[in-house]
Amino acid sequence: KSSNEATNITPKHNMKAFLDELKAENIKKFLYNFTQIPHLAGTEQNFQLAKQIQSQWKEFGLDSVELAHYDVLLSYPNKTHPNYISIINEDGNEIFNTSLFEPPPPGYENVSDIVPPFSAFSPQGMPEGDLVYVNYARTEDFFKLERDMKINCSGKIVIARYGKVFRGNKVKNAQLAGAKGVILYSDPADYFAPGVKSYPDGWNLPGGGVQRGNILNLNGAGDPLTPGYPANEYAYRRGIAEAVGLPSIPVHPIGYYDAQKLLEKMGGSAPPDSSWRGSLKVPYNVGPGFTGNFSTQKVKMHIHSTNEVTRIYNVIGTLRGAVEPDRYVILGGHRDSWVFGGIDPQSGAAVVHEIVRSFGTLKKEGWRPRRTILFASWDAEEFGLLGSTEWAEENSRLLQERGVAYINADSSIEGNYTLRVDCTPLMYSLVHNLTKELKSPDEGFEGKSLYESWTKKSPSPEFSGMPRISKLGSGNDFEVFFQRLGIASGRARYTKNWETNKFSGYPLYHSVYETYELVEKFYDPMFKYHLTVAQVRGGMVFELANSIVLPFDCRDYAVVLRKYADKIYSISMKHPQEMKTYSVSFDSLFSAVKNFTEIASKFSERLQDFDKSNPIVLRMMNDQLMFLERAFIDPLGLPDRPFYRHVIYAPSSHNKYAGESFPGIYDALFDIESKVDPSKAWGEVKRQIYVAAFTVQAAAETLSEVA
């Protein structure tokens, strides 16, 4: 049978039928259903939701829907011994205490099991000492403090504002600086957009609102006790002392009302420049310690959270492919939330639910995709991407042989301005072509394509007339698929105007105020942006699963490889003398990129010309496309980060959320001027150039004619 016979309907009609079946009203209904109570990972409520989703996906028509459970390390506050921070006087009396919980939003006063704000996986402890304000606690902030200002954080409690980088990186930096505790807070400069009211009157963060979140530095390991292997019934677990990525000092998050009480008394050094000042009416003095009258007062943390091995549940749904059932296209997003999950994750989960329903409707009419589609509702994403990582560890052999693509589906919105896409270069053309076929939901772009509004509002910095598409970093469930397994991955959501809104993420991120009402009243009353995101995510899955030739363009990888090689070369050339002294050359890398470009070009020509009616040749060409991403995987991984194995992309060592290109070379060059042994340091740069050049060349050769 040809693929069209196997799927019963012509491909064009398939896609239209699928997209036409997606309804904004259903997404709205699903979002409401998913957000009425908290669904914290490891709780009974989240298990019940898993079973509900399993049941509904079966009703929608999937071939099978199973729960996959794992027993992983999670972290919870002590219910009878709350976490808080105090200002204490010289007698040890607590003269101020931070809040024990957030003021509940209207209509949710009687909801039980709202977990109070906490930093997941913080160790227990009651450190007391002087405070040091460390800005965003980025690598460069600690450089400024230690190298320029000569301020020693050793034995101090540091207070850092949320934003710019992943909170786990902040904690790691504070630990390395010798701090004995970390206080994280949301500054209005980052979480209060001018001219907008705070919740419940608008989408800004109120003073009592607090961002929860994990503070791990897992580097892709998954469950801290079972790195590399699934946390199943017969798992061997490490002792807590050997667990991966746990912080060693107490950490606690607070809102800006409480932060003001701590920061208003700060003395010591003035802030080094205006970039260290937020929007509170406080001096933003760095410290250490409080000013004159208050110099005898100290800060004391009271942290009593516990780490517990707890059962989590993924929901895995299968829609079997008619022609290539052994090729998997995966759509996955998490289900667990910190509290109600109005945006994160349920705005994404509601979209996945509607995509499943639409696919199910087509299947009930006799249609099947060419390739198998797997749908996943991941658990424990908020605790370190645990559900997705454990499932991928359990199924790694299948995935590395059969995985075509992974499309992530966390929050559908973080604003309502324009589309935001991060993906492998292999998917650039797919995304461009798809968005040209979709209608823009934006005001002022009626009758225009999504591609047009997106390109106008978020232009590519390199190519005129094209939209910006970003590198994949981490901080979400695509990590294991892309960074560890080398499966082509992408994500899409609606975002804010980054030009005018310079706050980090969205203001109510991971707070109790992330409710259904937040979305319905302020972000997307008509659910038109949710529908657009459903069309983009669903459309990508549809094309990946149903197109006869995989919709990957290897030439786009060639273009970015050249760009990344130029960039890393220019970073290295900031040290011309050392490059000469240690004979550092990038010739091998540029040569490999040139070869990749030529071979990719020839492959693309062959792709146009080959006989698509020959199933063996078709399968061969598709396999070359599928395995190209895999070819960028180094089985040895990156230095000290064995689960980050992609040579072209990795999460930044300084910010998990951001993607870094040629990360091995980048990290070897980072701060190289401060290394005690320059010869060894530049030797490592040379080794990393060698690894990168070899990998690019090896990947290129997978696209050569097979014989």
């Epitope: 809040s99 003021p103 009592g208």
Partner: antibody, heavy 126, light 110 residues
Framework: EVQLVESGGGVVQPGRSLRLSCAAS????????MHWVRQAPGKGLEWVAV????????YYADSVKGRFTISRDNSKNTLYLQMNSLRAEDTAVYYC???????????????????WGQGTTVTVSS | QAVLTQPPSASGTPGQRVTISCSGS????????VYWYQLLPGTAPKLLIY???QRPSGVPDRFSGSKSGTSASLAISGLRSEDEADYYC???????????FGTGTKLTVL
């Protein structure tokens, strides 16, 4: 309708105790700081005490420190003022008041009071 | 306990504009928002002005507040007979970790 209703006032001898209650309705009590304010006969308003929305912080006027205790029961939407070692100068109308919250700004001005009860009279006399 | 200083009385004829002053220090008015309350005879205090110069809904725009340094003032334009009441300013006092009221001003509409 947002409402605060005080109760528990009365005549009491010096040195004795009294507990005032303030029942709140029509708003999310758990989300607001609450104050007690008093007005002695023929005098002006005097702030007495404040408690944060979660009960984690309590502050008192010097004139009542060590004698009065402010508390709240969020499950009952009720604010309390336990008054011990009462003195003649504690004679006043006692008001409970809700801390004002302004959603258009982010400065924590320890906002004033936007909703007041009708007051309950406490008379300390031998 | 520190208090904010107000004139004991003020007066005006209907339609006139009157101003009530409130003087404090750097630890109260100087570093915190000022609030104004109206006490009509036999009723509970009513919030008139918050955050120095903001009016709650339902308060006529005849009432306006301002703050400069360690002083604040309440202006009432188009004076009406129902404005006859006691007026109190108030602010948080950082040195007390508490709240202070003004001495109060009795406004008479002549």
């Amino acid at each position: 309708e947002v409402q605060l209703v005080e109760s528990g006032g009365g005549v009491v001898q010096p040195g004795r105790s009294l507990r005032l209650s303030c029942a709140a309705s029509g708003f999310t009590f758990t989300s607001y700081g609450m104050h007690w304010v008093r007005q002695a006969p023929g005098k002006g308003l005097e702030w007495v005490a404040v408690i944060s929305y979660d009960g984690s912080n309590k502050y008192y006027a010097d004139s009542v420190k060590g004698r009065f205790t402010i508390s709240r029961d969020n499950s009952k939407n009720t604010l309390y003022l336990q008054m011990n070692s009462l003195r003649a100068e504690d004679t006043a109308v006692y008001y409970c008041a809700r801390e004002h919250y302004d959603s258009s700004g982010y400065y924590h001005g320890y906002y004033g009071m936007d909703v007041w009860g009708q007051g309950t009279t406490v008379t300390v006399s031998s | 306990q520190a208090v904010l200083t107000q004139p004991p009385s003020a007066s005006g004829t209907p339609g006139q504009r009157v101003t009530i002053s409130c003087s404090g220090s750097s630890s109260n008015i100087g570093s915190n928002y000022v609030y104004w309350y109206q006490l009509l005879p036999g009723t509970a205090p009513k919030l008139l002005i918050y955050s120095n110069n903001q009016r709650p809904s339902g308060v006529p725009d005849r009432f306006s507040g301002s703050k400069s340094g360690t002083s604040a003032s309440l202006a009432i334009s188009g004076l009406r007979s129902e404005d006859e009441a006691d007026y109190y300013c108030a602010a948080r006092d950082d040195s007390l970790s508490g709240y202070v009221f003004g001495t109060g001003t009795k406004l008479t509409v002549l």
